[in-house]
Interface confidence: low
């Protein structure tokens, strides 16, 4: 094949290189570009930056490599439009520094940055950890820092992400209140920060106020949804990112819901409950206290993590027809308290007789092995009737 | 020249408090850790805490913690330590010293605030 | 913490002596400093990252040593040597010193 006079050359069949001495100072308008998995960049001393834009519609490029240039600066967002990135080189260039942001995402196999002069600070901490962890083949390449020695040996004492503390409302949140929340942030060069409110949708009217280092979140006019609903601050330094969720515990009375029961395992009450604070329950049988016991007990469904709603059953193990009957359940806390009840039959009384039966008329006191599979009631021996009044 | 200069000697009760200043001059005040170390009579060289003056992110060393309030002034470029709750074994020479990030050394030290504390 | 143990405690040397001061760390430090310290004065700093002259401070002061052992030399005592030597560690958090080795005057 003839030699490639252009700036860049195919190789391969989805790969470009681009070795003539000073022929490029960016990255757009690449021939081929959509298709290109391997890109190979050499002795361009007029790149210096590496932008956003540079990289869009490489979607699909895995193995990048610009080495012996002039790149002076990676965007913390240059990578973005190359989420399958897995190799990339930058060795030799003029880096000073590299964002954490600038490799979050991607799931890099390789980085290479040696022969860069880079600068020992806080923000090469996610880098360091790497070599710690021996990650993407850095501790390989012993990297040093101008000036300074080896990036394994900075001290990081002082390297930490943001430290948040969000401040919620001590006092009780009833609906329809509005909610201040502020969130602190601690830390050295901080960049960013903010709310993630995702989770609330139409749990209250939203508005954010201040900035770094003190941001605030006002909550208007708050639901009950709002409940168990995170509310997230978050913070980034050159370090790297933290958040901090947070849940607003919105009071409202407690509610109840009993369905029919069903037979499962177990005879099983279903119910539903609601109410913030959890409300405390009783159970009622015909209306007296239901003492529960290993028999008749109340056991919860495992809660939804977004929701204050609890649902459970009244557990019957093996009931007859003296669990038949008005099951009421209370459900109280400081705000309210609700009952429901609800008619049960697990088992007809076999004692409860219907006029137009047969009646029968005696119990010999000489039958005393029953062999209906009905109960035989006996007292003593002497021989009784049984009179029935048809009224 | 890069210089930092401690306020004077004090002299406490036990359960009282005492707030020690540190001027600096001679370079940017908030790029750089300032870190505070004392030294009981007799005794070796003790870390207290450091702050960084641009953002007064602050941590000490666990033995301090609740008691002592590190602080930084960017208008007159004065960091301060406050300690509280002072007992006896709280009398020593406070010394501030800046943190030189390019080679990773306290450089700069300040002459010292001997401060006391009788009953 | 890193603790930071220095031998010997004291010292007596002449004038023209060489002196050996030994620092170890109780887990593995990347770099060493040291610092000399006079009576009423501030420390002050002689040697950073185990082997590099703090500004002002003559060659006959020199540092080696790694991972937990290190090493002061002065190579020719001089009068105003007399003092007392700290070794220090900033690799991990926090910062620890050493308990001081004091040099007199034998």
């Known amino acids: 094949a003839a030699p490639c006079p252009d700036a860049c050359c195919p190789h391969g069949s989805s790969g470009l290189r681009c070795t003539r001495d000073g022929a490029l100072d960016s990255l757009h308008h690449l021939p081929g570009a959509e298709n290109l998995t391997e890109l190979y960049i050499e002795n361009q001393q007029h790149l210096q930056h590496l932008e956003l834009r540079d990289l869009r519609g490489l979607g699909e490029l895995r193995n990048l490599t610009i080495v012996k240039s002039g790149l002076r600066f990676v965007a913390p967002d240059a990578f973005h439009f190359t989420p399958r990135l897995s190799r990339l080189n930058l060795s030799f260039n003029a880096l000073e520094s590299l964002s954490w942001k600038t490799v979050q995402g991607l799931s890099l196999q390789e980085l290479v940055l040696s022969g860069n002069p880079l600068h020992c600070s806080c923000a090469l901490r996610w880098l360091q950890r790497w070599e710690e962890e021996g990650l993407g083949g850095v501790p390989e390449q012993k990297l040093q820092c101008h000036g300074q020695g080896p990036l394994a040996h900075m001290p990081n004492a002082s390297c930490g992400v943001p430290t948040l503390k969000v401040q919620v409302p001590n006092a009780s949140v009833d609906v329809g209140d509005d909610v201040l929340l502020r969130c602190q942030v601690e830390g050295r060069g901080l960049e960013q920060a903010g709310w993630i409110l995702t989770e609330l949708e139409q749990s209250a009217t939203v508005m954010k106020s201040g900035g770094l280092p003190s941001l605030g979140l006002t909550l208007a006019n708050v639901t009950s949804d709002l409940n168990r609903k995170n509310v997230t601050c978050w913070a980034e330094n050159d370090v790297g990112r933290a958040e901090v969720s947070v849940q607003v515990n919105v009071s409202f009375p407690a509610s109840v819901q009993l369905h029919t029961a069903v037979e499962m395992h177990h005879w099983c009450i279903p119910f539903s409950v609601d109410g913030q604070p959890a409300p405390s329950l009783r159970w009622l049988f015909n209306g007296s206290v239901l003492n529960e016991t290993s028999f008749i007990f109340t056991e919860f469904l495992e809660p939804a993590a977004n929701e204050t709603v609890r649902h459970g059953c009244l557990r019957l193990n093996q009931p007859t027809h003296v669990n038949n009957g008005n099951y009421t359940l209370l459900a109280a806390n400081p705000f309210g308290q609700a009952s429901a009840s609800i008619m049960a039959a697990f088992m007809d009384n076999p004692f409860e007789f219907n006029p137009e039966d047969p009646i029968p008329v005696s119990f010999s006191p000489v039958d005393t092995n029953s062999t209906s599979g009905d109960p035989v009631e006996k007292k003593d021996e002497t021989p009784f009737g049984v009179s029935v009044a048809v009224g | 020249q890069v210089q930092l200069v401690q306020s004077g000697a004090e002299v406490k009760k036990p359960g009282a408090s005492v707030k020690v200043s540190c001027k600096a001059s001679?370079?940017?005040?908030?790029?750089?850790?300032m870190h505070w170390v004392r030294q009981a009579p007799g005794q070796g060289l003790e870390w207290i805490g450091t702050?960084?003056?641009?953002?007064?992110?602050?941590s000490n060393a666990q033995k301090f913690q609740g008691r002592v309030t590190l602080t930084a002034d960017t208008s007159t470029s004065t960091a301060y330590m406050e300690l509280s709750s002072l007992r006896s074994e709280d009398t020593a020479v406070y010394y501030c010293?800046?943190?030189?990030?390019?080679?990773?050394?306290?450089?700069?030290w300040g002459q010292g605030t001997t401060v006391t504390v009788s009953s | 913490d890193i603790q930071m143990t220095q031998s010997p405690s004291s010292l007596s040397a002449s004038v023209g002596d060489r002196v050996t001061i030994t620092c170890r760390a109780s887990?593995?430090?990347?770099?060493l400093y040291w610092f000399q310290q006079k009576p009423g004065k501030a420390p002050k700093p002689l040697i950073y990252?185990?082997?590099n002259l703090a500004s002002g401070v003559p060659s006959r002061f020199s540092g080696s040593g790694s991972g937990t052992d290190y090493t002061l030399t002065i190579s020719s005592l001089q009068p105003e040597d007399f003092a007392t030597y700290y070794c220090?560690?900033?690799?991990?958090?926090?910062?620890?010193f050493g308990g001081g080795t004091k040099v007199e005057i034998k």
């Open positions: 010293t800046r943190f030189y990030y390019e080679d990773w050394y306290f450089d700069v």
């Open positions: 001679g370079y940017t005040f908030t790029t750089y850790w």
């Open positions: 702050i960084y003056p641009g953002n007064s992110d602050s």
């Open positions: 887990s593995s430090v990347s770099y």
């Open positions: 990252r185990t082997s």
């Open positions: 220090q560690q900033y690799h991990s958090y926090p910062p620890t």
